[in-house]
């Protein structure tokens, strides 16, 4: 059938979703593309419980999530409403800081070393997390 009952190899199951944690770094757009090619998306954090789960797996390492404001307002990549949804920004973030000298502001969100969120330059090569819903992650066996 087309519905998965468990996550693929190297993916971690949690609350009806499957998560994949990178061990290398990519720019936000390249990380987003990587997840899309897996029929997944950069992780969308919808609760404190999910925040703690992801934080536990990534450790104290800057890691991209599926949140950006490259087109104006902050948006989650799967369409989850930002304004009414869960948020875990560091104090005084996001600040769209221009002082980094790399051109432009800061349009992509990441987990910081303490798990709270910061906006940063999207070209920075951070680790990333992909997420896909369990019932969407299924692969029926090849027809022989």
């Amino acid at each position: 059938g087309s519905e998965r009952t468990c996550c693929p190899v190297n993916w971690v199951e949690h609350e009806r979703s499957c998560y994949w944690f990178s061990r290398s770094g990519k720019a936000w757009a390249d990380a987003d593309n990587y997840c899309r090619l897996e029929d997944a998306h950069l992780v969308v954090v919808t609760s404190w419980e999910e925040q703690k789960f992801v934080q536990h797996h990534i450790g104290p390492v800057n890691t991209w999530m599926g949140l950006h404001d490259q087109n104006g307002p902050w948006k989650w990549v799967d369409g989850t409403d930002y304004e009414t949804g869960f948020k875990n920004w560091r104090p005084e973030q996001p600040d769209d800081w221009y002082g980094h000298g790399l051109g432009g502001g800061e349009d992509c969100a990441h987990f910081t070393d303490d798990g709270r969120w910061n906006d940063d330059v999207c070209q920075r090569p951070y680790r990333w997390v992909c997420e896909t819903e369990l019932d969407k992650a299924s692969q029926e066996p090849p027809l022989l």
Epitope: G1, S2, C7, P8, V9, N10, W11, C18, W20, R36, L37, E38, D39, A40, C130, T132, K136, A137, S138, Q139, E140, P142, L143
Partner: nanobody, 116 residues
Framework: EVQLLESGGGLVRPGGSLRLSCAAS????????MSWVRQAPGKGLEWVSS????????YYADSVKGRFTISRDNSKNTLYLQMNSLRAEDTAVYYC?????????WGQGTLVTVSS
């Protein structure tokens, strides 16, 4: 055996249009989300667009949003990509794909060349 066969590629001038098709067989087409991905010369794979199994939910890369339209006909087991306002940077081999986390199926691809 899963098979995905793309067609409709070719040479087109900037600003022109093409419609790609992908004939699917060997699996229950209507039960799966389907995607288009592309690979430009000398570049890596780029996700272009995906469509839900019923055709009512679509997703697009920012680079093609507003120019490309993905659709499907489950009665014909066929996936489509309507490409308008084509640009030189759209030149690539386009693949129809049944993407799944941890396991993918791909077609052989169809070449789209945008040049004056």
């Amino acid at each position: 055996e899963v098979q995905l066969l793309e067609s409709g590629g070719g040479l087109v001038r900037p600003g022109g249009s093409l419609r790609l098709s992908c004939a699917a067989s060997g699996f229950t087409f209507s039960a799966y989300r389907m995607s288009w991905v592309r690979q430009a010369p000398g570049k890596g794979l780029e996700w272009v667009s995906s469509i839900g199994k019923d055709g009512n939910v679509t997703y697009y890369a920012d680079s093609v949003k507003g120019r490309f339209t993905i659709s499907r006909d489950n009665s014909k087991n066929t996936l489509y990509l309507q490409m308008n306002s084509l640009r030189a940077e759209d030149t690539a081999v386009y693949y129809c794909a049944k993407l799944r986390a941890g396991f993918d199926y791909w077609g052989q691809g169809t070449l789209v060349t945008v040049s004056s």
